[in-house]
């Protein structure tokens, strides 16, 4: 569970589990910084605009970030 | 498997402290945020707080703001509520339970707290 | 903050459906997780994110939430199943926290 206020890092759990494509809303990545030292991936789904974190670390997470990236990279002109 | 233990519950006089710890194990530890939660004798949950995977965020409940402190130990799998000033609603069966994204997905069996003025 | 609303009992035959009430304002726009507490014992997860059951947790447990209500749907209860039920939502409205209900004793009779 994500939390809105800036207040170092952002994520309450991150998770391992990849998330449907087709029920992505938004994806988005947020780099380490001085408030937060790790990378967070918030994804933001259709239902009810929930968020969660996913771990970066995550081998299913990564190949999520792949397949996100190729599928956007086809529909851009 | 998951396994929360929790420890520290005993008997404490009104206006003095406890700490209580609840061992974690069988899930990694640092990738999930962690909550108290208690249960006053015959009564409903409360939730009480939760610490962020990485220890960075807590979250308390107004009836315990100011007085217990969350706090986790990632590299003993740990997570620790230090009470201060306990009052005699705080008796309560006080239970460690990980969060899963919204929903409370595994409980420890709790430890007992008695308040006696 | 959000406030969860449940009956105290439900009593039932078994082999019944039982049909356990959250009420909230606007709950139906939250994900709302279920919980079933038998005595001496503690909570466990038996509906999460609306209708989802976790793994090992019998069909017969599901759920519904839209409007101002969510719902927990034991079909052909048994008597195992008697025991305390919370619903329970993430409220991130004011301040973080997560709010129960505040619980339905449900009664196999």
């Known amino acids: 569970v994500p939390l809105s206020r800036t207040v170092r890092c952002t994520c309450i759990s991150i998770s391992n589990q990849p998330v449907n494509p087709r029920s992505l809303e938004k994806l988005e990545i947020i780099p380490a910084s001085q408030f937060c030292p790790r990378v967070e991936i918030i994804a933001t789904m259709k239902k009810k605009g929930e968020k969660r974190c996913l771990n970066p670390e995550s081998k299913a997470i990564k190949n999520l970030l792949k397949a996100v990236s190729k599928e956007r990279s086809k529909r851009s002109p | 498997q998951v396994q929360l233990v929790e420890s520290g519950g005993g008997v404490a006089q009104s206006g003095k402290s406890l700490r209580l710890s609840c061992a974690a194990s069988g899930f990694t530890f640092s990738n999930y945020g962690m909550h108290w939660v208690r249960q006053a004798p015959g009564k409903g949950l409360e939730w009480l707080a939760v610490i962020s995977y990485d220890g960075s965020n807590r979250y308390y409940a107004d009836s315990v703001k100011g007085r217990f402190t969350i706090s986790r130990d990632n590299s003993n799998n740990t997570l620790n509520l230090q009470m201060s000033s306990l009052r005699a609603e705080d008796t309560a069966l006080y239970y460690c339970?990980?969060?899963?994204?919204?929903?409370?997905?595994?409980w420890g069996k709790g430890t007992l707290v008695t308040v006696s003025s | 903050l959000t406030q969860l609303t449940q009956p105290p009992s439900v009593s039932l035959a078994p082999g019944q459906t039982a049909t356990i009430t959250c009420g909230g304002d606007n709950i139906g726009r939250k994900s709302v997780h279920w919980y079933q507490q038998k005595p001496g014992q503690a909570p466990v997860l038996v509906v999460y994110?609306?209708?989802d059951r976790p793994s090992g947790i019998p069909e017969r447990f599901s759920g519904s939430n839209s409007g101002n209500t969510a719902t927990l749907t034991i079909s052909r209860v048994e008597a195992g199943d008697e025991a305390d039920y919370y619903c329970?939502?993430?409220?991130?409205?004011?301040?973080?926290?997560?709010?129960f209900g505040g619980g339905t004793k449900l009664t196999v009779l």
């Open positions: 339970a990980k969060d899963a994204g919204g929903p409370l997905d595994y």
């Open positions: 994110d609306d209708t």
């Open positions: 329970q939502v993430w409220d991130s409205s004011i301040d973080h926290s997560w709010v």
